[in-house]
């Protein structure tokens, strides 16, 4: 193993990470020295993990602390042995305090599951350390949770099947350890953007994995294929959901962050994207009537092409709390687009455009926009993202999504943008013009557009309004209306029917 230890700046703290390497510095020195040095004023040895049963939606309420072997607090605080029990597990912390997302999640769980037990696993003393040390403590914390669960199982009516561990960042791997160490199998683990550093590529027993619970679902919101990935990139659950490709989250760009605060930094962007997993989960709890659907796909690029909007053979699922158990799958990667804020739901459409002739295109890819007109609403002007290139005499597939429910689609306006948007495109246009001076008229022909709704699984074909006019050129538009054969529906199930 290489001796070079990369220095990693995460948020405003620089720390070294190298598994097992002693790191002599950190916030206010080595915290474990403080925690384990005998003090004259602190003689009692306290467990490093506390279990706080949140007995009220009031975030300021102190709740009840549970400890193994002490049954009285369970009675005093009305712990419901037959109800669902949620364990919320926080991650690494720089401040040593619970972050704001915590009470949002607690409150959402109480709102959705009124009789449930909501327990916050407080491992702040072990998490408020150098990242490497916090990572090394995850196993210990997992053991503590497993011990608590083993003790609860001794009680009448308590079932591990009713236990749902929800772990954020480093807490997701803590949940994995807990599920691994407990006697029996917990019902569910949800990993909210599980931590990447020191876990990416790790052995199955040293990170969250599908073996850790009856059902393991994961949301990945801060993965990076270049630079540091704060969240783990690899799939680690039965289903692994990558909203917006699992990397750049809408509303979290530097511009968005700068817009909302005077001194926006990369810190806020990182926090926003990493924490987005929590908010997507909260959204699934409180906006039950607006579920977001994810679609199985081999990779993000194929999803961006609109190829993967199928619900056949369990290829789509609700995200977050409403996800349907899929134990037969492992490491199934699923994708979706989202809005920038709650409710996050969008409506996905696959657009298949058959280009049957293609004149004088040169090197430059055209920029297309579509506007969808529906019975409920009309969309904004939506860009057609060209992932590779426009193919001639072939069907080109695109993904578009709208923030509102348009209802049944009635017509489509396709626009080819005239003016180039970048100097690079302008240069390519100029070169193209020089190389083809006698064929200035760029044009392509489209007869029909086939549209499939991801949410309803309905398919519809749109034909040009004027069958004689199928050509489109820069700065022009082409209108399409529902073809006479109307809605064409295959034997594909709608996610709204299939999912709970």
């Amino acid at each position: 193993m290489s001796n070079s230890v990369p220095l990693l700046c995460f948020w405003s703290l620089c720390y070294c990470f190298a598994a097992g390497s002693p790191v002599p510095f950190g916030p206010e020195g080595r915290l474990e020295d403080k925690l384990h040095k005998p003090k004259a004023t602190q003689t009692e040895v306290k467990p490093s993990v506390r279990f706080n049963l949140r007995t009220s939606k009031d975030p300021e309420h102190e709740g009840c602390y549970l400890s193994v072997g002490h049954s009285q607090p369970l009675e005093d605080c009305s712990f419901n042995m037959t109800a669902k029990t949620f364990f919320i597990i926080h991650g690494w912390t720089m401040s040593g305090i619970f972050e704001n997302w915590l009470h949002k999640l607690v409150s959402a769980l109480h709102t959705r599951e009124k009789d449930a037990n909501v327990v916050v696993v407080d491992w702040l003393p072990l998490a408020h350390q150098l990242y490497t040390d916090a990572v090394n403590n995850t196993r210990v914390v997992g053991h503590s949770i497993a011990r608590m669960l083993d003790w609860l199982q001794e009680k009448d009516d308590f079932s591990l099947g009713n236990v749902h561990l929800i772990g954020y960042s480093l807490g997701a791997h803590v949940a994995g350890y807990a599920g691994n160490f407990v006697k029996g199998t917990v019902g569910r683990i949800t990993g909210l953007d599980p931590a990447g550093p020191m876990f990416e590529g790790a052995d199955i027993h040293k990170r969250l994995s599908p073996d850790d619970a009856d059902f393991v679902d994961v949301l990945h919101t801060y993965t990076r294929s270049f630079g540091l990935s704060i969240g783990i990139q690899m799939p680690v659950g039965h289903i692994d959901i990558y909203p917006n490709g699992g990397d750049f989250q809408p509303g979290c760009g530097l511009n968005d962050v700068l817009g909302s605060i005077a001194y926006g930094t990369i810190t806020e962007v990182v926090k926003c994207e990493h924490e987005r997993a929590v908010h997507l989960f909260v959204d699934s709890l409180v906006n039950q009537d607006k579920p977001s659907f994810a679609f199985q796909c081999t990779d993000s690029n194929r999803f961006k092409k609109g190829i993967c909007l199928s619900c056949r053979k369990n290829r789509c699922n609700s995200i977050g709390y409403n996800a349907k158990k899929m134990r037969n799958k492992r490491n199934s990667k699923m994708y979706l687009k989202t809005r920038a804020g709650m409710p996050f739901r969008v409506y996905h459409y696959q657009m298949k455009i058959h280009v049957f002739s293609y004149k004088n295109m040169g090197e430059i890819e055209p920029t297309f926009y579509v506007t969808l007109y529906g019975t409920n609403a009309d969309s904004q002007t939506l860009p057609l993202e060209i992932v590779e290139r426009i193919e001639q005499n072939a069907t080109n597939t695109f993904l578009v999504y709208t923030e509102e429910d348009l209802g049944d689609l009635l017509k489509i306006q396709l626009t080819w943008e005239g003016a180039s948007q970048s100097w690079y495109n302008l240069w390519k246009e100029f070169r193209s013009y020089l190389s083809q001076p006698r064929n200035p008229g760029r044009e392509l022909n489209i007869r029909r557009i086939r549209v499939k709704s991801g949410e309803t699984q309905r398919k519809l074909t749109f034909c040009t309004e004027d069958p004689e006019n199928t050509s489109i050129s820069p700065g022009r538009e082409l209108w399409f209306r529902k073809c006479r054969d109307g809605w064409r529906m295959k034997n594909e199930t709608s996610p709204t029917v299939e999912l709970p």
Partner: antibody
């Protein structure tokens, strides 16, 4: 009822050490964090940092790193603020104030304050 | 660090009238629909006392003539109708996520 009772006024010379206490009653001491706040004469409030009353881990703001130390005597439900190598600019009233670990971290109960005068 | 700027530094209000104190933050103190801004009252020789938490929630035992509003970076404390016993210095404080948590410079209210 909930109370935070601080030790009495202190008169010290520069270079000396002072230890101010804050005794809590009426609630479970380890279930709430304890803050320390400085108020120089005729000035506003300045947050110094806080201590986790369960783990004993202190957190200091940049201006209060070095000569300042937060500590606990959990069995006596008491938090302490110690200032070493006192300087004239440490002359102020020091308050302890609790906050909930959960929720929005406002300071709901305060000690009556301890006036520290540093003068040669 | 988030800087809180209170205005005015001092104000004199007649008995029964409205007192309005403003607090501007250098960056947003909101988090997912909640504002992490709080208001305290401090009388001479006494510790501060919590009046309003999370921008607009009245602490128990505080008279209803005190109210708070605002979101993002702009917050207001209103006292109406002002009473004699309201003469004090008022401080805003933010506790949005990672410390340091900060206080505004204070506004001294005098009753005419």
């Amino acid at each position: 009822q909930i109370q935070l009772v601080q030790s009495g006024p202190e008169l010290k010379k520069p270079g000396e050490t002072v230890k101010i206490s804050c005794k809590a009653s009426g609630y479970t001491f380890t279930n709430y964090g304890m803050n320390w706040v400085k108020q120089a004469p005729g000035k506003g409030l300045k947050w110094m940092g806080w201590i986790n009353t369960y783990s004993g881990v202190p957190t200091y703001t940049d201006d209060f790193k070095g000569r300042f130390a937060f500590s606990l005597e959990t069995s006596a439900s008491t938090a302490f603020l110690q200032i070493n190598n006192l300087k004239n600019e440490d002359t102020a009233t020091y308050f302890c104030a609790r906050f909930s670990y959960y929720g929005r971290h406002y300071f709901d109960y305060w000690g009556q304050g301890t006036t520290l005068t540093v003068s040669s | 660090d988030i800087v809180l700027t209170q205005s005015p530094a001092s104000l004199a209000v007649s008995l029964g009238q409205r007192a309005t104190i403003s607090c501007k933050a250098s960056q947003s103190v909101d988090y997912d629909g909640d504002s992490y801004m709080h208001w305290y009252q401090q009388k001479p020789g006494q510790p501060p006392k919590l009046l309003i938490y999370a921008a607009s929630n009245l602490e128990s035992g505080i008279p209803a003539r005190f109210s708070g509003s605002g979101s993002g970076t702009d917050f207001t404390l209103n006292i109406h109708p002002v009473e004699e016993e309201d003469a004090a210095t008022y401080y805003c404080q933010q506790t949005n996520d990672d410390p340091p948590w900060t206080f505004g410079g204070g506004t001294k209210l005098e009753i005419k």
